[in-house]
Interface confidence: medium
């Protein structure tokens, strides 16, 4: 079979947006299966037409309605003949147009008067491509060959830059890059003490505007009264915007404030946020827990717990816990040092414990008291029925 590309030179140059019809003539075959190939890959679409001119002469057309850069490449047609693939002479399709940007100036954030660079690159065909830079609406410098780097000594306010690429087909304008001025960050906000214990506090906050420079750290300052002596200053890397304050004094009023810093310096401090650490849980267990059987039930008594330290705060109420070996159990909260226990089975052994609580929680449990089911009911006074151990 004789294959040839018709009506097209070995090199075909077309302007972007123009139509192209590549024609391929096949002679010497009755029913050729003509395939178009671009850069080694079969063109898998229906923009193709095959016309029988005579029994052994066919013309295949590949139609491109509006060529763009991606259509440029090496085209040929091929047919299968007796198990062998015959290919035509290739045609190189070049698509010319206004320059195409491969690199455009990017937005930047820079410190005042600091030098910086912007880059611009555009390609043809046709070459050569020259670059002209614009600062706002003012052209800066003469045409330079692509690629071009613009060196700027510094700016004192936000400024816009763009580049323009020229070739024989015309000009193309790049995106406009905005060069922003960096500034000190704004103060943080929404400062919250998220968790409190007697000696620790977790703090979280939202960063203010970063001043177009990455926030590097935040400082949490703690005092015992707003404007008082600094108790603690913690510098934390960010993100996350959280901090754990350790080794605080229980049941104490504190205030904290936060500021954050970028490369240019720190933000103003946010307003003071007051908080109070929790007091300590009671340190002592109630002593001398004992039981008195009565006709109506069981009376439990113990000695009052006196606070060991002011940080424990006021004590009370007491919490009583009892359990029986039949699985029955319960808890009771009482204000004094005496409790009347009901709802227990006198035929089973009873184990009782008591603790004293405050605003923080319950202190240690007392030694357990075992009230044996073998104790005689209603016995009041004899030592063996008033047992504490």
């Amino acid at each position: 079979a004789g294959l040839k590309l018709m009506g097209a030179p070995v090199k075909l140059t077309v302007s972007q947006g123009q139509p192209v019809k590549l024609n391929c003539s096949v002679e010497g075959m009755e029913e050729p299966d003509i395939q178009w190939v671009k850069d080694g890959a079969v063109v898998q679409n229906l923009d193709q037409l095959y016309i029988p001119v005579s029994e052994q002469h066919w013309i295949g057309f590949l139609s491109l309605k509006s060529v763009e850069r991606s259509d440029a490449g090496r085209y040929w047609c091929q047919v299968e003949d007796g198990g062998e693939t015959e290919i035509s002479q290739p045609v190189w399709l070049t698509v010319e147009g206004v320059p195409f940007f491969t690199v455009e100036p990017k937005d930047l954030a820079v410190p005042p008067n600091a030098p910086f660079q912007l880059s611009c690159e555009a390609v043809g065909p046709p070459e050569p491509v020259t670059i002209v830079w614009w600062r706002g609406t003012t052209k800066i410098g003469g045409p330079a060959p692509s690629p071009s780097v613009l060196n700027v000594t510094g700016v004192t306010q936000s400024t816009m830059f763009s580049c323009e690429a020229h070739n024989l087909k015309g000009l193309a304008s790049s995106r406009t890059a905005t060069v922003h001025l960096q500034a000190l960050p704004a103060a943080p906000f929404n400062i919250t003490v998220t968790k409190l214990s007697s000696s620790n506090a977790s703090v979280a906050w939202m960063p203010g505007a970063d001043g177009r420079a990455l926030l590097q750290s935040c400082t949490v300052q703690v005092t015992q009264a707003p404007g008082g002596w600094e108790v603690l200053a913690v510098v934390v890397p960010v993100p996350p915007f959280t901090c754990l304050l350790r080794d605080l004094v229980p049941a104490t009023n504190y205030s904290l404030r936060v500021r954050c810093a970028n490369a240019l310096g720190p933000s103003p401090y946010a307003d003071w946020v007051p908080f109070q650490t929790k007091g300590l849980a009671p340190a002592s267990a109630p002593q001398n827990l004992h039981a008195i059987r009565t006709d109506s039930g069981l009376i439990l008594e113990w000695e009052e717990v006196i606070p060991e330290a002011p940080l424990e705060g006021p004590l009370g109420p007491y919490k009583l816990s009892w359990v029986q070996d039949n699985g029955t159990q319960d808890e009771l909260t009482v204000e004094g040092t005496r409790a009347n226990l009901t709802g227990w089975d006198p035929q089973k052994d009873l184990i009782v414990r008591v603790c004293v609580s405050n605003a923080v929680g319950c202190g240690p449990w007392s030694q357990p008291l075992v009230v044996s089911s073998h104790d005689r009911a209603g016995q009041q006074g004899p030592p063996h029925s008033r047992t504490s151990w």
Partner: antibody, heavy 125, light 108 residues
Framework: EVQLVQSGADVKKPGASLTISCQAS????????ISWVRQKPGKGLEWMGQ????????LYGPSFQGHVTISADRSTATAYLQWRSLEASDTAMYYC??????????????????WGPGTLVTVSS | SYELTQPPSVSVSPGQTARITCSGD??????AYWYQQKSGQAPVLVIY???KRSSGIPERFSGSSSGTMATLTISGAQVEDEADYYC???????????FGGGTKLTVL
């Protein structure tokens, strides 16, 4: 003269199978593509797919892929459209279309088409 | 899947110019074809490759394409031009054809 003769109207129940045909004459069957086009009552045209008689290469529209089969018999110059299981929504007129082009001087193709008269398929229980 | 959008109807008086549009994202790269279908008849190819008139079609029919819009123009519409008109083009992938929804032309 180019002619496309389509099989007659048919009434089927849902779930039935059906094959309709389009017999070509007046040209070399293997030289051209034949398309099938659907037109539901009172509605627009829908391209279903096409086959090239020469190599029985087929292409389908996304809505019809897997629902119908397009085939051709070179010996009788006939193209076929086949359903394995008809649905009421397949009720429509089905046209076969021959795509063609000719050249004057070998470089500018002039495009033309021939349409068959259509086959009315009614699917109803 | 790819779609071509046409106005459902267009009305003109005899002798006036009728314009029927067809929009599709792939039309900047793919050719538009136009069909005329009169009531009870098979469609007829009127325009191919955006602007080429099919053999036997009167000169008052013309086609154009710009960007994502193809247009069929009938200059000096006649009563016999009353019909449904369909645009037809390749999908953006180039792997299947699509018809527009059709436009009913009324010549009052």
């Amino acid at each position: 003269e180019v002619q496309l003769v389509q099989s007659g109207a048919d009434v089927k129940k849902p779930g039935a199978s059906l094959t309709i045909s389009c017999q070509a004459s007046g040209y070399t069957f293997t030289d051209y593509w034949i398309s099938w086009v659907r037109q539901k009552p009172g509605k627009g045209l829908e391209w279903m797919g096409q086959i090239r008689g020469q190599h029985s290469s087929t292409l389908y529209g996304p809505s019809f892929q897997g629902h119908v089969t397009i085939s051709a018999d070179r010996s009788t110059a006939t193209a076929y459209l086949q359903w394995r299981s008809l649905e009421a929504s397949d009720t429509a007129m089905y046209y076969c279309v021959r795509h063609g082009a000719s050249t004057s001087g070998g470089t500018i193709p002039e495009y033309y088409q021939h349409w068959g008269p259509g086959t009315l398929v009614t699917v109803s229980s | 899947s790819y779609e071509l959008t046409q106005p459902p109807s267009v009305s003109v008086s005899p002798g006036q110019t009728a314009r029927i549009t067809c929009s599709g994202d792939a039309l900047p790269k793919k050719y538009a074809y136009w069909y005329q279908q009169k009531s009870g008849q098979a469609p007829v190819l009127v325009i191919y490759e955006d602007a080429k008139r099919s053999s036997g079609i009167p000169e008052r029919f013309s086609g154009s394409s710009s960007g994502t819009m193809a247009t069929l123009t009938i200059s000096g519409a006649q009563v016999e031009d009353e019909a449904d008109y369909y645009c037809y083009s390749l999908s953006d992938s180039g792997n299947y054809f699509v018809f527009g929804g059709g436009t009913k032309l009324t010549v009052l």
